[in-house]
Interface confidence: low
């Protein structure tokens, strides 16, 4: 190829070229200058720049790295908040299918403990999307408020269904006994352990999409030093204050510009790294209990099945709680 | 035991948002987002090449810029880089990151921690026979994982856990709906034997 | 298409190991567990075990105490089972075949182990 | 082991005239998640099984519709409305709930 043409006299490449930059103002010299008060584009001889261009210069350096940095992540971005969005959405699908199951499990096995069941388990569920969404609420206390509020129900509908409209007094003594009893068996315990692992793991997995996202908008709107700036001004366009318009950058010296530019952005990658293979690590293991689409779908079945056992134990429990709570119905009588 | 309930269907439709393929599971789609993650794994390591490949850099041409003075492009000069005498390209490095890069390393190393310790340990269950006995409430060993529901009569304490219900309710149309006997595939994203 | 191709027939003496292979096509091998059984001439199915290739979890039918190992190779979509310490009453005809249901069998492969 | 029991282990029958294979299992093979994990296979002279129905009475595709199943719990029966000829084969019972998952011994169905 041939020598690019040296700078003419006039300045006139120059200018024309950076008046495409910042149009109407008259920065650039008329003839070239000595340049003595340039900091970045350093002349070896006359030059085209002057001070106010290089500053110019300097801007539109970091806006073009700026813009390369937002168009690299583009995909992994969207990858990202798209993946969030849908997951997001699908777990709620899945709370909304579970609550449906156990919802039709109770009208279509006891339809007597509706509508306070369906009460109590939208309640339960709402509690459900709230933890995965990131709520501060306590998962044991969930499942021990729903089978305590359950418990009444089944008691009074179910297993002793002569006694008259419940009372708040009795109520309160049902659902302690229902803990002091172990009414249900080991059954809040299983469904305890089941719900938390499974919402523990969906929830850190969400959180850590969500962080993902704030990682790569935190690079994305990275905000380059001044030093990087100079140097990605050397770089791209002090060439054209010698009459370079045409001549491009070297790969080698490009490379080691920008891993000065990204020094800190790069310090990211030990942790991104891990963070994906610990996600890995982490969707590896989400199956049987720690998977909240499998251990969600199929709560309505333990529910019924922790219903059968109280049923099963029916005699003896009402025994048990005639004696326990007596004063409580006493009261309720008259 | 307990059906699944047909009369409350409402979400059939918005159900197939979880599946971009037909056949496509919760499961299946976590572990194409890994894949695709994976992808990025050397992302910000790559990124100063990612970002040379994608600005103007002389490739074909016999000169190229080195910040100073227009060289071959294979000469030593075209690797020097004429910032003697400016900014040390070392010093820059030696700055440490930006502080708002600083604070998303100290949540990404907590996220991090927090991904390790929620991460399921492995083959814990695996190879032992599957032995069931029907056991009173208490009777579940100190690992609850090894305690699920049984259809009935109790609860059953199972050696081995051995199933996994990877569908977002996608078949139920078909397969679950009770007294259903259209012709249909089965899928396979059912239980299966090593998920519970 | 789904396809399952086993490896072909051997021919073993006792106490020798043999080690079937099963070439999964048509589908993501990584998602679905592949199971072993096998059928003596004459005889029944009966169930060896599996593995999940995805996870490389395994299950096996105690009845073999240790003797069948299932492992699985994800880049080459193949499933393998190798049978060790072999009796003439291993003779027999390996099937892999595709989890749930098993609506996918391979062809077979026969096995003889005799002195 | 659940031990899976077919009768009658073998079944002359006339082309046109109905069949029904029984099943038994030793222990119930519905699973918390409502589904009873049994199917049934139908194994040709010299071929590898194949698949007739899952999950007790769901036709695999592209299985004729003389092929129908029922039960639940620990009862099974698999039905054929009308023999042909191409029906002939050994049936095999299966359950998938239980590790190791076993099989029935077969009925060897045969026309007379």
């Known amino acids: 190829q041939p020598p690019p043409p040296p700078p003419d006299a006039t300045c006139h490449q120059v200018r024309s070229f950076f008046q495409r930059l910042q149009p109407g103002l008259k920065w650039v010299p008329e003839t070239p200058v000595p340049g003595s008060d340039l900091q970045v584009c350093l002349p070896k001889g006359p030059t085209c720049c002057s001070r106010k261009m290089e500053e110019k210069y300097q801007l539109t350096a970091r806006l073009n790295m700026e813009q390369l940095l937002q168009s690299a992540s583009m995909e992994l971005k969207f990858l990202i908040i798209q993946n969030a969005a849908v997951f997001q959405e699908a777990f709620e699908i899945v709370v909304r299918h579970a609550k449906n199951y156990t919802n039709a499990m109770f009208k279509n096995n006891y339809p007597s403990l509706t509508p306070q069941a369906f009460e109590f388990v939208g309640e339960f569920f709402t509690d459900v999307s709230l933890y995965i969404l990131g709520s501060d609420i306590n998962v044991d206390d969930m499942v021990n408020e729903l089978f305590d509020s359950l418990f009444p129900v089944i008691y009074t509908q179910l297993m002793n269904p002569g006694l008259p409209d419940s009372a708040l007094d009795i109520n309160e003594c049902l659902r302690g006994a229902r803990r002091d009893l172990k009414v249900f068996g080991n059954f809040p315990k299983l469904i305890m352990t089941q719900v938390s692992k499974s919402l523990q793991v969906t929830r850190i997995f969400l959180q850590a999409l969500n962080l993902g996202i704030e990682v790569i908008n935190t690079t994305d709107h990275l905000k380059f030093s001044k030093d990087c700036g100079r140097m990605l001004t050397r770089m791209w366009y002090c060439s054209y204050c010698q009459g370079l318009m045409m001549v491009k950058p070297c790969g080698g010296y490009c490379n080691v510009v920008m891993q000065g530019c990204m020094a800190g952005v790069v310090e990211i990658d030990k942790y991104w790294r891990e963070y994906i293979l610990s996600l890995e690590e982490l969707v590896n293991g989400m199956y049987r209990i720690y998977d909240m689409e499998n251990v969600l779908l199929g709560l309505f079945s333990t529910i019924h099945d922790s219903i059968q056992y109280v049923q099963k134990n029916a005699g003896k429990l009402t025994t048990t709680i005639g004696k326990l709570c007596a004063h409580s119905q006493q009261r309720q009588y008259r | 035991s307990a059906y699944y309930p047909e009369d409350l269907f409402i979400d059939k439709k918005v159900l197939k948002v979880a599946h971009v393929e037909h056949e496509e599971t919760l499961s299946s789609r976590r572990r194409e987002l890994i894949q695709k993650l994976k992808s990025f794994i050397s992302f910000y390591s790559a990124l100063p090449g990612y970002i040379c490949s994608h600005s103007p850099v002389a490739e074909n041409d016999t000169l190229c810029w080195n910040g100073q003075e227009l060289v071959e492009r294979y000469s030593q000069k075209a690797a020097r880089n004429g910032m003697k005498n400016q900014f040390n390209l070392h010093e820059l490095k030696m700055k440490g990151p930006e502080p708002v890069v600083s604070q998303i390393i100290d949540k990404l190393k907590h996220i991090n921690q927090l991904l390790r310790t929620m991460s399921v340990p492995k083959g814990r269950v695996l190879d032992k026979n599957l032995d069931e006995e029907g056991f009173e409430s208490g009777d579940c060993g100190d690992d609850e994982d090894e305690c699920i529901g049984g259809s009935g009569d109790g609860m059953m304490k199972v050696k081995n856990q051995l199933r996994f219900l990877a569908e977002l309710a996608y078949d139920l149309d078909v397969d679950d709906v009770p007294g259903n006997n259209q012709q249909a595939t089965p899928k396979d994203n059912e239980i299966s034997t090593f998920h519970n | 298409e789904v396809q399952l191709v086993q490896s072909g027939a051997e021919v073993k003496k006792p106490g020798a190991s043999v080690k079937v292979s099963c070439k999964a096509s048509g589908y993501t091998f990584s998602d679905y567990e592949m199971h072993w059984v096998r059928q003596a001439p004459g005889q029944g199915l009966e169930w060896m075990g599996a593995?999940?290739?995805?996870?490389?979890?395994?299950a096996y039918n105690q009845r073999f105490k240790g003797r069948v190992t299932i492992t699985a190779d994800k880049s080459t979509s193949t499933a393998y089972m190798e049978l060790s310490s072999l009796r003439s009453e291993d003779t027999a005809v390996y099937y892999c075949a595709r989890f749930y249901s098993y609506a996918y069998w391979g062809q077979g492969t026969l096995v003889t182990v005799s002195a | 082991d659940i031990v899976m029991t077919q009768t009658p282990l073998s079944l002359p029958v006339i082309t046109g005239e109905p069949a029904s294979i029984s099943c038994r299992s030793s222990q119930s093979l519905v699973h918390s998640n409502g589904n009873t994990y049994l199917q049934w296979y139908l194994q040709k002279p010299g071929q590898s099984p194949q698949l007739l129905i899952y999950k007790v009475s769901n036709r695999f595709s592209g299985v004729p519709d003389r092929f129908s199943g029922s039960g639940s719990g620990t009862d099974f029966t698999l039905k054929i409305s009308r023999v042909e000829a191409e029906d002939v084969g050994v049936y095999y019972c299966?359950?998938?709930?239980?590790?190791?998952?076993?099989f029935g011994q077969g009925t060897k169905l045969e026309i007379k």
């Open positions: 593995i999940h290739p995805g996870s490389g979890d395994t």
């Open positions: 299966s359950q998938s709930i239980y590790v190791p998952y076993t």
